[in-house]
C-alpha cells in the first residue's frame, strides 16, 4: 500500500500541468460505452480493461492511463495500472473504483471499457477413472506423425511437462497470469493444478493418445488450480503469443483456448486481431447446455468453436448441463470420456469430458492439416474442417427446438488424405443473430474477410418477414434480412465460399408490379448466377404466384414476386460454372429440399414463390431447404405449392490446378 501511495504522489506531481477538469467528451455519436459480464457471479468489479481506439499508439495509451490516475487522484481515488496493452489491442488494465467509470469513459481515445470477469476450464469432471497401467489401444488410432510443422499454444492450467505422453513435446513458457484460488483452506496439490492442461496437451499431441503426434506445443498458464482464470489474464496471454510471433516468426500457429466465460467484447476483439494476424484459434463452445453465442471466446466469429459429442454422435451431457450449441458453434468433436494424460503420475492416464476435449481434438486436426498444407488461411482451414466432417449424424432432438436449425450437424474428422482437396469449391452457411421482433429490425450475416458471399436468404419462424438482400458494407457484401410487423424476428443466412480471383456483383430489379413477376439476370459477359434474393417493402406480400420455371435458355435468371425487388448475385471467376436446380411440390408441404449432385457445390438457395406462407430458405451442407407454414394452416390450394431453387456450382479452374499439382 505504501508503494502505491508513493507512485501516486509522483503521478500527480508529474501531471499537474495537465488540464484539471474532465477530459473533453468525445464527439457526438462516438460516446465510449461500458460493458460487463451478463453472468453476475462471474463479474470481477474493481478491475477494468480500458480499450482505446484502433489507431492509438503505445505512448498515447500510457498517457491516457496516467491521465486517468491523475484525475482519479484529484478526486481522492486510488488507482493502479496493472498492464498496458499493445500488440493486439491498444488499452490498459486498471484496478479502480467503479465510481470512476464515468470519468474514464470521457477520456480521449477511449473506445469502450469492460469490467473484468472470470473464465473457466471446460472439462467436467476432472478425474473420472484412472487407467493403469498406461496402455492405450494403439490399434484404434495410428495416423502418421502429423503436425510437425505446426506450433500449438495452449492457454490453460499449469501442466506436468515430464508426463510420458507429452515429454519433449510441450515447452512450458514463463507466462503466468492467474487469479488467487477461492477459499481460505484451498490446498494446492500439483497433480490437481496440472490436471486440465496436461490432459489437453495429451489429446492434442500425446505419444499414444494424441491426435497430432508430431505437433509441438507451448503452454501458457491462464487458469489457476481450480481451473479458473480471468478475461484480462487471457488477453495478456494472447498478447504474449502475438509478441512471440513477431519476435520469432515460425510456421503455422494454432492457439487452443479450452476455456469459456460470459460474452466479452474485448476478448472477442483480441481473438479477431490475432486471427487476422494469421493465427488459427480453436476454442471450447462451453459446457453450459446453452447458446454458445452467450460465451467468449466461443462467440468470436474468427475463432473455430467446437461443441462436444460422444461415441454415439450424441451431444454430450455433463451432469445437469452439457455441450453448448447454436450458430456460434462451427462443428462438434469427441468430448466424452476422452482418454489422455493424467497429472497423477508420469505414466497415468485418465478420461475427461467436455468441450475442452472436443476443442483439443480439432486443434490436433488443424495442426495435421496445416502441417500438410502450411499455406492454408484460416478461412481455408475452417472450410476444410467443415467439408471433411461427418454430416447429419448428431441427434438434433437433444438441442432446444429453436436452436436445431442454427446448430451445425457436423462432427470433425481427419481428411481421408491430407492433400488433394484443392479442386473443391468450398462453401459454408453462416447464420446471423436473431433480428429481434420489431418492425424495423434487421439481421445481418457476414462472411469471413477472404470468403465471397455467393448468396443470401432469410428465415422467420412466424413467416412474417420482408425478405433479404445483399448489400455493400465496408467494401464487402453482407446479407441483410428484414423483419415485418408482428413477426417474431428473422435470421439472415449467408452462403460463404472460397472462390479465388472472383469478381462478384449484385444486380437488382425493382418490383415489376404490373407484370406477372420480377426478373433479373446476369448480363455481364462471363458472369454466372450464384444466388437469388428477394426483398419487399410491403408488409403483406400478396398471393400472386410468379412463373416458377425460368424460360429455357435463360439459366442465369432470378424470378420472383411482382411486388418484390429481386437481387441476383453474379460472379466471374476462372472456370466457374453454375446451374439452377429446382424441386417443386404441388401440394402444401412443411419442407421442400433440393440437393446438388456429387462434384457440385450449393452456392444459392431460395424459394418460389416468395409469398407469406414461406418461412424461408437455407442451405444445409449441399442441400437447399425451403420451409413453409404448418400444412394445416395453409389449406390445400395452389397457394401451398412451393419450389426449392438451388444453384449448384463447380470450378473447373480449381480442378485443373489441383491436377497439375499432383
Amino acid at each position: 500500500q505504501e508503494d502505491e501511495d508513493g507512485d501516486y504522489e509522483e503521478l500527480v506531481l508529474a501531471l499537474r500541468s495537465e488540464e484539471d477538469g474532465l477530459a473533453e467528451a468525445p464527439e457526438h455519436g462516438t460516446t465510449a460505452t461500458f460493458h460487463r459480464c451478463a453472468k453476475d457471479p462471474w463479474r470481477l468489479p474493481g478491475t477494468y480493461v480500458v480499450v482505446l481506439k484502433e489507431e492509438t499508439h503505445l505512448s498515447q495509451s500510457e498517457r491516457t492511463a496516467r491521465r486517468l490516475q491523475a484525475q482519479a487522484a484529484r478526486r481522492g481515488y486510488l488507482t493502479k495500472i496493472l498492464h498496458v496493452f499493445h500488440g493486439l489491442l491498444p488499452g490498459f488494465l486498471v484496478k479502480m473504483s467503479g465510481d470512476l467509470l464515468e470519468l474514464a469513459l470521457k477520456l480521449p481515445h477511449v473506445d469502450y471499457i469492460e469490467e473484468d470477469s472470470s473464465v473457466f476450464a471446460q472439462s467436467i469432471p476432472w478425474n473420472l477413472e484412472r487407467i493403469t497401467p498406461p496402455r492405450y489401444r494403439a490399434d484404434e488410432y495410428q495416423p502418421p506423425d502429423g503436425g510437425s510443422l505446426v506450433e500449438v499454444y495452449l492457454l490453460d492450467t499449469s501442466i506436468q511437462s515430464d508426463h510420458r505422453e507429452i515429454e519433449g513435446r510441450v515447452m512450458v513458457t514463463d507466462f503466468e497470469n492467474v487469479p488467487e484460488e477461492d477459499g481460505t483452506r484451498f490446498h494446492r496439490q500439483a497433480s490437481k493444478c496440472d490436471s486440465h492442461g496436461t490432459h489437453l496437451a495429451g489429446v492434442v499431441s500425446g505419444r499414444d493418445a494424441g491426435v497430432a503426434k508430431g505437433a509441438s506445443m507451448r503452454s501458457l498458464r491462464v487458469l489457476n488450480c481450480q481451473g479458473k482464470g480471468t478475461v484480462s489474464g487471457t488477453l495478456i496471454g494472447l498478447e504474449f503469443i502475438r509478441k512471440s510471433q513477431l519476435v520469432q516468426p515460425v510456421g503455422p500457429l494454432v492457439v487452443l483456448l479450452p476455456l469459456a466465460g460470459g460474452y466479452s467484447r474485448v476478448l472477442n476483439a483480441a481473438c479477431q486481431r490475432l486471427a487476422r494476424a494469421g493465427v488459427v484459434l480453436v476454442t471450447a463452445a462451453g459446457n453450459f447446455r446453452d447458446d454458445a453465442c452467450l460465451y467468449s471466446p466461443a462467440s468470436a466469429p474468427e475463432v473455430i468453436t467446437v461443441g462436444a459429442t460422444n461415441a454415439q454422435d450424441q451431444p454430450v451431457t455433463l451432469g445437469t448441463l452439457g455441450t453448448n450449441f447454436g450458430r456460434c458453434v462451427d462443428l462438434f468433436a469427441p468430448g466424452e470420456d476422452i482418454i489422455g494424460a493424467s497429472s497423477d503420475c508420469s505414466t497415468c492416464f485418465v478420461s475427461q469430458s467436455g468441450t475442452s476435449q472436443a476443442a483439443a481434438h480439432v486443434a490436433g486436426i488443424a495442426a495435421m492439416m496445416l502441417s500438410a498444407e502450411p499455406e492454408l488461411t484460416l478461412a481455408e482451414l475452417r472450410q476444410r474442417l467443415i467439408h471433411f466432417s461427418a454430416k447429419d449424424v448428431i441427434n438434433e432432438a437433444w438441442f432446444p427446438e429453436d436452436q436445431r436449425v442454427l446448430t451445425p450437424n457436423l462432427v470433425a474428422a481427419l481428411p481421408p488424405s491430407t492433400h488433394g482437396a484443392g479442386w473443391q469449391l468450398f462453401c459454408r452457411t453462416v447464420w446471423s443473430a436473431h433480428s429481434g421482433p420489431t418492425r424495423m429490425a434487421t439481421a445481418v450475416a457476414r462472411c469471413a474477410p477472404d470468403e465471397e458471399l455467393l448468396s443470401c436468404s432469410s428465415f422467420s419462424r412466424s413467416g412474417k418477414r420482408r425478405g433479404e438482400r445483399m448489400e455493400a458494407q465496408g467494401g464487402k457484401l453482407v446479407c441483410r434480412a428484414h423483419n415485418a410487423f408482428g413477426g417474431e424476428g428473422v435470421y439472415a443466412i449467408a452462403r460463404c465460399c472460397l472462390l479465388p480471383q472472383a469478381n462478384c456483383s449484385v444486380h437488382t430489379a425493382p418490383p415489376a408490379e404490373a407484370s406477372m413477376g420480377t426478373r433479373v439476370h446476369c448480363h455481364q459477359q462471363g458472369h454466372v448466377l450464384t444466388g437469388c434474393s428477394s426483398h419487399w417493402e410491403v408488409e403483406d406480400l400478396g398471393t400472386h404466384k410468379p412463373p416458377v420455371l425460368r424460360p429455357r435458355g435463360q439459366p442465369n435468371q432470378c424470378v420472383g414476386h411482382r411486388e418484390a425487388s429481386i437481387h441476383a448475385s453474379c460472379c466471374h471467376a476462372p472456370g466457374l460454372e453454375c446451374k439452377v436446380k429446382e424441386h417443386g411440390i404441388p401440394a402444401p408441404q412443411e419442407q421442400v429440399t433440393v440437393a446438388c449432385e456429387e462434384g457440385w457445390t450449393l452456392t444459392g438457395c431460395s424459394a418460389l414463390p416468395g409469398t407469406s406462407h414461406v418461412l424461408g430458405a437455407y442451405a444445409v451442407d449441399n442441400t437447399c431447404v425451403v420451409r413453409s407454414r404448418d400444412v394445416s394452416t395453409t389449406g390445400s390450394t395452389s397457394e401451398g405449392a412451393v419450389t426449392a431453387v438451388a444453384i449448384c456450382c463447380r470450378s473447373r479452374h480449381l480442378a485443373q490446378a489441383s491436377q497439375e499439382l499432383q
Epitope: S435, G436, P437, T438, R439, M440, A441, T442, F485, G486, E537, V538, E539, D540
Partner: antibody
Framework: EVQLVESGGGLVQPGGSLRLSCVVS????????MHWVRQATGRGLEWVSG???????SYTGSVKGRFTISRENAKNSLHLQMNSLTTGDTAIYYC????????????WGQGTLVTVSS | EIVMTQSPATLSVSPGERGTLSCRAS??????LAWYQQKPGQAPRLLIY???TRATGFPARFSGSGSGTEFTLTISSLQSEDFAVYYC??????????FGPGTKVDIK
C-alpha cells in the same frame, strides 16, 4: 407513465447543423422501434426517420445523407443529428414510439421546434 | 412511395351529428392503416390501427373501416372534444411511412 421529451430545437442558419434528443421514461426503451416525425407550421405530418432497438435505421428520401438517427439504449435516449439544413426542414420535430403489438405510433413527445432561417 | 389523400379538407359538423372522413391510398395498403387525432398545440394521438381497431383511451363512437385503397373514419356523434385534425397513415409499404394531408373537423 410513458413519457417522451424532445430537446435541442432552435434557430439555425441554412447549411447549419442541429442535434435533437428525446429522453424517454415509463417503458423499456430498448424493446421498441423509435421514430422522428415532423410537422411544418400549419401543415401535415411527415415521417422523417426510424431506428430499431439494435440500431437498424431508415430515412425518408429528402433527408437521406443529411440526417442521422441514433439511440443510446442504456441512457433511454434517441437522437437526430441534422446536417446541411435547409428552410424546408423548418418544423416541429416529434419523437414517437411503435409497439410490437400495436402498429402505428402509439406514444409521442410534445415536440421541439426547429427553425432554419438566415 | 404511396401517396395518401384525404377528403374533405375540412368537415364542418354540429355537435351530436355524425362525421365521416375518407382516406385514399395510391395503391393497396391492405389493412395497414392508422388514424391519428391532433388538437391544436398538442402532439398527435393514435386513434385507430389496422384500419378498424380502436386504440386505448378512445370511446366507441370512433370507428374505422375499409381495406385496400379506400378507408373511412366515422365519428357517430361528435362531441366538443372531438373537434381536431385527423390524419391517416399507411404502414404497409415503407420507407417511407406516409401520412395524408389531414381533415380538419370543426364546429358548424
Amino acid at each position: 407513465e410513458v413519457q417522451l421529451v424532445e430537446s435541442g430545437g432552435g434557430l439555425v442558419q441554412p447549411g447549419g447543423s442541429l442535434r435533437l434528443s428525446c429522453v424517454v421514461s415509463g417503458f423499456t426503451f430498448g424493446d421498441y422501434d423509435m421514430h422522428w416525425v415532423r410537422q411544418a407550421t400549419g401543415r401535415g405530418l411527415e415521417w422523417v426517420s426510424g431506428i430499431a432497438p439494435a440500431g437498424d435505421t431508415s430515412y425518408t428520401g429528402s433527408v437521406k445523407g443529411r440526417f442521422t438517427i441514433s439511440r443510446e439504449n442504456a441512457k433511454n435516449s434517441l437522437h437526430l443529428q441534422m446536417n446541411s439544413l435547409t428552410t424546408g426542414d423548418t418544423a416541429i420535430y416529434y419523437c414517437a414510439r411503435e409497439d410490437i403489438a400495436v402498429p402505428g405510433f402509439d406514444y409521442w413527445g410534445q415536440g421541439t421546434l426547429v427553425t432554419v432561417s438566415s | 412511395e404511396i401517396v395518401m389523400t384525404q377528403s374533405p379538407a375540412t368537415l364542418s359538423v354540429s355537435p351530436g351529428e355524425r362525421g365521416t372522413l375518407s382516406c385514399r391510398a395510391s395503391q393497396s395498403v391492405s389493412s395497414n392503416l392508422a388514424w391519428y387525432q391532433q388538437k391544436p398545440g398538442q402532439a398527435p394521438r393514435l386513434l385507430i390501427y389496422g384500419a378498424s381497431t380502436r386504440a386505448t383511451g378512445f370511446p366507441a363512437r370512433f370507428s374505422g373501416s375499409g381495406s385496400g385503397t379506400e378507408f373511412t373514419l366515422t365519428i357517430s356523434s361528435l362531441q366538443s372534444e372531438d373537434f381536431a385534425v385527423y390524419y391517416c397513415q399507411q404502414y404497409n409499404k415503407w420507407p417511407p411511412f406516409t401520412f395524408g394531408p389531414g381533415t380538419k373537423v370543426d364546429i358548424k
